[in-house]
């Protein structure tokens, strides 16, 4: 069966949008008006993985780009990166684990936990214009809660 995907944007709980910062990095900042067009549109694919009522495994690709968010060890630390893939082979139902995030829904907010590194989450800083990263703490200074906005194809 083909993998199912939809297009969406993500904003953190402080309403910061995600934009490209160089070829392989995302940053989070407040956008208004026409600047909203800068925000990244994700192609969220619903992939194979452990699922429960509030946890759904997804992969996060950048729409119409052969880039996916992935989680790897760098200097012994779980790290978020944008990884280039062969567009002929992606997306697929059985994504490699580094590409898989557990989309967890709590009180209408979403968290994205790395499947590769449990308890590590896609995170943003309180500060403006800082990189999106993989954080190992919830409920602290860093932001791990997001909302999803659906975008028509």
């Amino acid at each position: 069966a083909p993998v199912r995907s939809l297009n969406c944007t993500l904003r953190d709980s402080q309403q910061k949008s995600l934009v490209m910062s160089g070829p392989y990095e995302l940053k989070a900042l407040h956008l208004q008006g026409q600047d909203m067009e800068q925000q990244v549109v994700f192609s969220m694919s619903f992939v194979q993985g452990e699922e429960s009522n509030d946890k759904i495994p997804v992969a996060l690709g950048l729409k119409e780009k052969n880039l996916y968010l992935s989680c790897v060890l760098k200097d012994d630390k779980p790290t978020l990166q944008l990884e280039s893939v062969d567009p002929k082979n992606y997306p697929k139902k059985k994504m490699e684990k580094r590409f898989v995030f557990n989309k967890i829904e709590i009180n209408n907010k979403l968290e994205f936990e790395s499947a590769q590194f449990p308890n590590w989450y896609i995170s943003t800083s309180q500060a403006e214009n800082m990189p999106v990263f993989l954080g190992g703490t919830k409920g602290g200074q860093d932001i791990t809660d997001f909302t999803m906005q659906f975008v028509s194809s």
Partner: nanobody
């Protein structure tokens, strides 16, 4: 052409049981995650349950967990929903859905669904 034909609905007393079936044709049934959604009178669609391709994983809405059991028989291209301990609030039209993917708690994607079968729970 994809076809999904539900059956097994009817009138049942509270606490009773029903088994719904969905006969599928027109696609490679075993390759697809399948599921059930329902629509109560005057309400929107509600996800009930899903089963993965190969049937090794099952998922349930909190409202039916422990009472309903989803299963599939790939040799017969048929999806089932065993409903026990039925309650008045289970009254709804039940639809079988092909390639059902749950996006959020209240949003689903699916490619096809059947015409539905009515389940009425009443004394």
């Amino acid at each position: 052409e994809v076809q999904l034909l539900e059956s097994g609905g009817g009138l049942v007393q509270p606490g009773g049981s029903l088994r719904l079936s969905c006969a599928a044709s027109g696609f490679t049934f075993e390759d697809y995650q399948m599921g059930w959604v329902r629509q109560a009178p005057g309400k929107g669609l509600e996800w009930v349950s899903s089963i993965s391709a190969m049937g090794n994983r099952t998922y349930y809405a909190d409202s039916v967990k422990g009472r309903f059991t989803i299963s599939r028989d790939d040799s017969k291209n048929t999806l089932y929903l065993q409903m026990n301990s039925l309650r008045a609030e289970d009254t709804a039209v039940y639809y079988c859905a092909e390639n059902l993917v749950r996006v959020t708690a209240r949003k689903w994607m699916f490619d096809y669904w059947g015409q539905g079968t009515l389940v009425t729970v009443s004394s």
